[in-house]
Amino acid sequence: SIPWNLERITPPRYRADEYQPPDGGSLVEVYLLDTSIQSDHREIEGRVMVTDFENVPEEDGTRFHRQASKCDSHGTHLAGVVSGRDAGVAKGASMRSLRVLNCQGKGTVSGTLIGLEFIRKSQLVQPVGPLVVLLPLAGGYSRVLNAACQRLARAGVVLVTAAGNFRDDACLYSPASAPEVITVGATNAQDQPVTLGTLGTNFGRCVDLFAPGEDIIGASSDCSTCFVSQSGTSQAAAHVAGIAAMMLSAEPELTLAELRQRLIHFSAKDVINEAWFPEDQRVLTPNLVAALPPSTHGAGWQLFCRTVWSAHSGPTRMATAVARCAPDEELLSCSSFSRSGKRRGERMEAQGGKLVCRAHNAFGGEGVYAIARCCLLPQANCSVHTAPPAEASMGTRVHCHQQGHVLTGCSSHWEVEDLGTHKPPVLRPRGQPNQCVGHREASIHASCCHAPGLECKVKEHGIPAPQEQVTVACEEGWTLTGCSALPGTSHVLGAYAVDNTCVVRSRDVSTTGSTSEGAVTAVAICCRSRHLAQASQELQ
């Protein structure tokens, strides 16, 4: 029968007694930076080219016995998971291996850097089709390694890395913390985070998605026909590298941003038991398990968006947090979140010619997060319209006044420490969906975009009684671009998007009276692109 991991990444419409994906990744080359490999294994013989690159440290210990099958174990297994004939994800992909880990699985930052430079030079000398680089390794945070990954990613290479097996925040490790890299955590057959002894998969905002990473059958370096189960985020990353190879083979022109958005879009949502993660990491960790798209073609018409969390601002009074989108993405909205509820909102601002999302901590606050909604919107022209505090009883308002511009997100930011306390809520006048409203003491920011065929609508969900969480979702065919809370709800901790749902979080209801102050309204802005849909139909 089909191994559980291959079944798990197969969309339901393809489910069968065997794994038979529509495209095997034959146009893509996958580089593997790992241990040496047993290239004559029946799973990978003829599929993996062992390069002459080797940069590894000496093995520790005087009694270390270098046994070939042990030296090759990790790399052989991963090569098999990516492209193995029997148990591989992308059965058509070809691979090249670089040895950067020694027989004990240890490497150096310098060895990995030189390996990445080797790939960059190979790409310049002999450009081929799309490239995927698999980095199934994790070490302490390294600014220089992250920068090298950024350079290679900006040269058009897709980098996929393991989140790490330290049951810790992936942002503390490299290359997992590099924003340009697709960082993968590990789940098991029950879609739960993988436990490895006393440790387990890493988590947090630097993880892009999870993938099967426990009890994964693959090529064993024991013998040329041997198979073995291995576990870890390396195996999970190998699955995503294989899926990426198949997506790129079907659509070779996909950019890194487009690929990442598709990986997120086609993932299984909300299947991971978040209780495994530390409480403060649950909201930051994506509840996504990688899967192949139901069809390798025809996804171009969708408006893809993802949520990007900033690092924590820290608790100082004037602390801020910044969330950024990838170079090819548009920032369509900006929100903020604070566990203490003490925050001074958020704003979109230009930084280096690109919009970023900045959240502001408040006096006595434990810190804030900025949350960016990053979307793929070709030919978009977006700008931010700001209304300063109105000081008028009706509150502050701002709308998109340019012809053809639509509202994609609302943000509000205030200077006073406790905005909204004892203030009545401001109600949005009906029939004016293209505007943002806020407190009279707040400055309001509207994200206004013009793009061919772009249309947006506002959806609200209000609950009169206090509740810890209020949600509103966009319906099928629409994509959530903006998520905010209607002003007047002083106990709101913040708002953020989870997939296509806008979540507004409030303080523990036991601390809130059930006056009108208790009313919580979540406001979602849902968009779609008729232009992308029409273009897709023409192509087909």
């Epitope: 065997e18 794994y19 799973e43 099958s69 148990a87 370096s221 024991d222």
Partner: antibody, heavy 119, light 113 residues
Framework: QVQLVQSGAEVKKPGESLKISCKGS????????ISWVRQMPGKGLEWMGL????????RYNRKFQGQVTISADKSISTAYLQWSSLKASDTAMYYC????????????WGQGTLVTVSS | DIVMTQSPDSLAVSLGERATINCRSS????????????LAWYQQKPGQPPKLLIY???TRESGVPDRFSGSGSGTDFTLTISSLQAEDVAVYYC?????????FGQGTKVEIK
């Protein structure tokens, strides 16, 4: 259901060429290896080699390397075993079998093709 | 190449009695990484293709009666038919699949006494 159907018995003269076939059905032919096994009259089983139809990767038993060619046409889910110049010692029953990582040569075997080479 | 040697070459057992076939490999087919023996047993009846009975030295293929069992590790293996039935008359082969070329034992013919 999953099955492998082999071509019929062949009677050939020494020096002639021959290509026998093995057609898979009921499963994704490209995703499983096909092995060929020889059984000479009254003798035991000998593994000759295998092919992975997905990419036409082959692996031969050294004993048979250069004596036979294993190939496949994935468009018609068929694997082949061929000889360019038969010898009397090639007289045998030839079996194809589906091969997968969790099994050696699985329970899916062809019915066998009897090849007789005689002048 | 790994050489597989079976004993005995033939075996006559009364109906309902135990039949034991041994197989020895010229090198170990046990691998530490998954602690599995890459050894299988096949049954072949006259005019039929072989049928897989046991793999990983002791795992019974689905549909195979539980009177068939496999044991052993490393280089020495045994196939046991706990209570011989008339339909068990056949030639039995052991096979290693730990390295290429895959090799079979010479076969053991089981008959009814």
């Amino acid at each position: 259901q999953v099955q492998l159907v082999q071509s019929g018995a062949e009677v050939k003269k020494p020096g002639e060429s021959l290509k026998i076939s093995c057609k898979g059905s009921g499963y994704s032919f490209t995703n499983y290896y096909i092995s060929w096994v020889r059984q000479m009259p009254g003798k035991g089983l000998e593994w000759m080699g295998l092919i992975y139809p997905g990419d036409s990767y082959t692996r031969y038993n050294r004993k048979f390397q250069g004596q036979v060619t294993i190939s496949a046409d994935k468009s018609i889910s068929t694997a082949y075993l061929q000889w360019s110049s038969l010898k009397a010692s090639d007289t045998a029953m030839y079996y194809c079998a589906r091969d997968y990582y969790s099994r050696p040569l699985s329970d899916v075997w062809g019915q066998g093709t009897l090849v007789t080479v005689s002048s | 190449d790994i050489v597989m040697t079976q004993s005995p070459d033939s075996l006559a057992v009364s109906l309902g009695e135990r039949a034991t076939i041994n197989c020895r490999s010229s090198q170990s087919v046990l691998y530490s990484s998954n602690n599995k023996n890459y050894l299988a047993w096949y049954q072949q009846k006259p005019g039929q293709p072989p049928k897989l009975l046991i793999y990983w030295a002791s795992t019974r293929e689905s549909g195979v009666p539980d009177r068939f069992s496999g044991s052993g590790s490393g280089t020495d293996f045994t196939l046991t038919i706990s209570s011989l039935q008339a339909e068990d008359v056949a030639v039995y082969y052991c096979q290693q699949y730990s390295s290429f070329p895959i090799t079979f034992g010479q076969g053991t013919k089981v008959e009814i006494k």
